[in-house]
């Protein structure tokens, strides 16, 4: 017999025929439905949170996640002590600033508490996927008359391990100027016309230095430097998301 | 549906290479995570080498520094370089596959594979 589970993904290749476990491929044994993905990510080296589609499974199920870092193979797991819920179903796991080792193979092992036979054990390089919180306190000064710089902070990560991302555009422009700054988190722009009005923002990411993570933070608040007059098209120069 | 064909295995001496590929078709394996498994006679199956579609690689402890793998999307083949055998390394190895959403996931839990080869032998004679 075929049975197809439906997994809510854009990869339909993952609209899965049974999974069939057993203990070596040729030997089959009764077909087990696969768990889905764990996803995680540490939000500012502060908590970090694993979630799963709880939704993809085809009765509620309240799902365990226990997790361990990779000391050994046969290091002991723990169980998740926060869990997330999505319509009273588990959903996911908040793992406090303390059980964090971002530079230890984290371990986690999802299950079905009903069908112990059900688990899946994932292995994540936690240093890839953190996503720093938003830059903060953006401040213009002129260093000359044609000269700006910008400078910002970020909160609880150390500087070199970030990577920024610096938007700019002039209430004449339709489209950001944007280039890398890397570590330092300051900006001149040598040139500005004062009869123009600018928009500034920054994002980050941990990347290259301390990890490899492709996630940018969030957009800064916008900050804005030059001549207040009334732009011709408001509209046009929206600042977009 | 994925095919997977291993090949490469043989009857190596203690201290030598071998190197094994794992050929796909029928699907890309570009968005796969997929794994390197060994099965010893009368012992569980266990993973070797596992491998998310976003490139993080992990290893079992016992073939940390002396196995290798790599993939080449183009060519729809995963590999396994395996230096300083010993004669512990003798098992079936078999090539595993499993679509995945996220470029980070890496199983090494074998029934979260959908797919996997036959199997080659490798014998490590001492």
């Known amino acids: 017999w075929s049975s197809k589970v439906l997994m809510s993904s854009a990869n339909e290749d993952i609209k899965a025929d049974l999974i069939l476990t057993s203990t070596a491929p040729e030997h089959l044994s009764a077909p087990t439905l696969p768990l889905p993905e764990v996803q995680c990510f540490v939000f500012n080296i502060e908590y970090m949170n694993c979630t799963w589609n709880s939704s993809s499974e085809p009765q509620a199920t309240n799902l365990t996640l226990h997790y361990r870092y990779k000391v050994s193979d046969n290091n002991t797991f723990q169980e998740c002590s926060h869990y997330l819920f999505s319509k009273e179903i588990t959903s996911g796991c908040q793992i406090q600033k303390e059980d964090i080792q971002l530079y230890q193979t984290f371990v986690v092992q999802l299950q079905d508490p009903q069908k112990p036979q059900r688990r899946a054990v994932q292995k994540l390089n936690l240093q890839n996927l953190v996503i720093p919180r938003a830059p903060e306190n953006l401040t213009l000064s002129n260093l000359s008359e044609s000269q700006l710089e910008l400078r910002w902070k970020s909160r609880h990560i150390k500087e070199r391990c970030l990577q920024y991302l610096v938007q700019y555009r002039s209430n004449r422009d339709r489209s950001w100027t944007e280039l890398i700054v890397n570590h330092e988190p300051r900006f001149s722009l040598p040139s500005v016309d004062e009869l123009k009005r600018y928009t500034f923002r920054v994002r980050s990411r941990y990347n290259p230095i301390c990890g490899s993570s492709q996630q940018w933070s969030k957009w800064s608040q916008p900050v804005h430097w030059g001549s207040h007059t009334v732009e011709e098209n408001p509209s046009l120069f929206a600042l977009e998301a | 549906q994925v095919q997977l064909v291993e090949s490469g295995g043989g009857l190596v001496q203690a201290g030598g290479s071998l190197r094994l590929s794992c050929a796909a078709s029928?699907?890309?394996?570009?968005?796969?995570?997929m794994g390197w498994f060994r099965q010893a006679p009368g012992k569980e199956r266990e993973y070797v080498a596992i491998d998310s579609w976003g490139g993080d690689t992990f290893y079992a402890d016992s073939v940390e520094g002396r196995f290798t793998f790599s993939r080449d999307n183009a060519k729809n083949e995963v590999y396994l370089q395996m230096n300083s055998l010993q004669p512990e390394d003798t098992a079936v190895y078999y090539c595993?596959?499993?679509?995945?959403?996220?470029?980070?996931?890496?199983?090494?839990?074998?029934?979260?594979?959908?797919?996997w080869g036959q199997g080659t032998q490798v014998t490590v004679s001492s």
């Open positions: 595993a596959g499993a679509p995945t959403s996220f470029a980070t996931t890496a199983y090494s839990s074998s029934n979260s594979y959908r797919y």
């Open positions: 029928g699907r890309t394996l570009s968005r796969y995570a």
